[in-house]
């Protein structure tokens, strides 16, 4: 953990620019408050000061999680980690941020998509997800339900479906109806992946039945 | 269902201000969104002018920057426009509109019927 | 600015044809394009947006395709509530820009 006590940090863009250039787990101050949250900052990949708001990559967390654990965060932000929706929509409402989502599929492909706008609503408006400007490898149509879909937790279902997305598809997520993508989904493992409903997906990369290998969630302010 | 209302004098001289309110039922405009103003002229052009964010951040059109100002009242609900230095080349029907994202501009989901206003002496 | 360029203009048709309007970008507008409907008398009313997605309530005879400079808006089978003037709209970048908007009249 690299945090200096004099050190206050909204994001890793601002730990990037006090000097501290090393991948590695960082303390970030709430923009609104004096609390503050552990955080992986990304240093490396196209520029750095990426902050990462989620990660999977071997099904070592339970994703199938409960609101209040998705609002505040869960998991290990060395490994798989949710970084918590209430930080993450303070943040997002200061400044303009970009999301970059990171994908990596069982044959050794890699994919994008990175939208040039995104802020999450705050929790009375249920952590509603807003996207614009999208471009990258992971397709040409957004795999988050644009407009502005609500989030959905098991315990909290703000979905446009009768059917209780995301206790049918696990995993907390901007679920509409219940979408065309989860990156919150079940993990399953090589040669497990495939016709799979409830996995991790991003249907307009891999279509409906894939579940991805790995995932990374990536923020920063568009001006860095 | 979110409804949007504007108001404001049909007939302003040239090189005075013109004033125009929007009224919006439904929805808070502090909760979420932009609240958008747009003209269209005769011969049906349409032209966006700018906005003011549920966070109270403004963005104006470059080609308006000098004469154009976008504030609200959230007490009231209200958000309101001020374009200075009027020209007969303003006369337009003035709309206000929600679009769908709150920090940028967006497609707008919700507009009001629109008030015609007339610049001439 | 990014400029759309809408055609055609006017559009004379039957109703029960297909019709398509296009919208060219004057630089790549991503998939943010929208399509209004302004009926007379009314004000833009939202059909598509992000370029393909159907707003709420819209018939399904409405649709829209597109990415990056090409956009188009087509309405499968015109019915005769189907007239009005039809705009594209970017907003890809600021300032959010409308094409010049095409008539649809019916025969």
């Known amino acids: 953990d690299y945090k200096d006590d004099d050190d206050k940090f909204r994001d890793c863009a601002e730990v990037f620019k006090s000097g501290h250039t090393t991948n590695g787990i960082y303390t970030l101050t709430f923009p609104n408050s004096t609390e503050e949250i552990k955080a992986y900052c990304d240093m490396e990949a196209g520029g750095g000061g990426w902050t990462i708001i989620q990660r999977r990559e071997d099904g070592s967390v339970d994703f199938q999680r409960t609101w209040k654990e998705y609002k505040v965060g869960f998991g290990n932000p060395s490994g798989e980690y949710w970084l918590g929706n209430e930080f993450v929509s303070q943040l997002t409402n200061q400044q303009r941020y970009v999301l970059k989502i990171h994908l990596k599929d069982w044959e050794g492909n890699e994919a994008y998509s990175l939208y040039e706008h995104f802020y999450l609503s705050s929790e009375e408006l249920n952590y509603r997800i807003h996207l614009k400007g999208l471009t990258g490898t992971a397709g040409k149509i957004s795999s988050i339900s644009q407009p502005g879909a609500d989030f959905s937790t098991k315990d909290g279902d703000n979905d446009k479906c009768i059917c209780k997305c995301s206790q049918m598809l696990t995993g907390g997520w901007w679920f509409d109806a219940c979408g065309p993508s989860n990156l919150n989904g079940m993990y399953y493992p090589q040669r497990q992946n495939t016709n799979k409903f409830n996995g991790i997906k991003w249907y307009y990369w891999k279509g409906s039945g894939y579940s991805l290998k790995a995932t990374t969630m990536m923020i920063r302010p568009a001006d860095f | 269902d979110v409804q949007l209302q504007e108001s404001g004098p049909g007939l302003v001289k040239p090189s005075q201000s013109l004033s125009l309110t929007c009224t919006v039922t439904?929805?808070?405009?502090?909760?979420?969104?932009?609240w958008n103003w747009i003209r269209q002229f005769p011969g049906n052009k349409l032209e966006w002018m700018g906005y003011?964010?549920?966070?109270?951040?403004?963005s104006y059109n470059p080609s308006l920057k000098s004469r154009i100002s976008i504030t609200r009242d959230t007490s009231k609900n209200q958000f309101f426009l001020q374009l200075n230095s009027v020209t007969p080349e303003d006369t337009a029907t003035y709309y206000c509109?929600?679009?769908?994202?709150?920090?940028?501009?967006?497609?707008?989901?919700?507009w009001g019927q629109g008030t015609s206003v007339t610049v001439s002496s | 600015s990014i400029v759309m360029t809408q055609t055609p203009k006017l559009l004379l048709v039957s109703a029960g044809d297909r019709v398509t309007i296009t919208c060219k970008a004057s630089?790549?507008?991503?998939?943010?394009v929208a399509w209004y409907q302004q009926k007379p008398g009314q004000s833009p009313k939202l059909l598509i947006y992000y370029a393909s997605n159907r707003y709420t309530g819209v018939p399904d005879r409405f649709t829209g395709s597109g990415y990056g400079t090409d956009f188009t808006f087509a309405i499968s089978t015109v019915q005769a509530e189907d007239l009005a003037i039809y705009f594209c709209?970017?907003?890809?970048?600021?300032?959010?820009?409308f094409g010049g908007g095409t008539k649809l009249e019916i025969k």
């Open positions: 509109a929600r679009s769908t994202f709150g920090h940028y501009v967006s497609s707008m989901d919700y």
């Open positions: 630089q790549s507008a991503s998939n943010d």
């Open positions: 709209q970017q907003d890809y970048s600021s300032p959010p820009t």
């Open positions: 003011i964010s549920y966070s109270g951040s403004t």
């Open positions: 439904g929805y808070s405009i502090t909760s979420d969104y932009a």
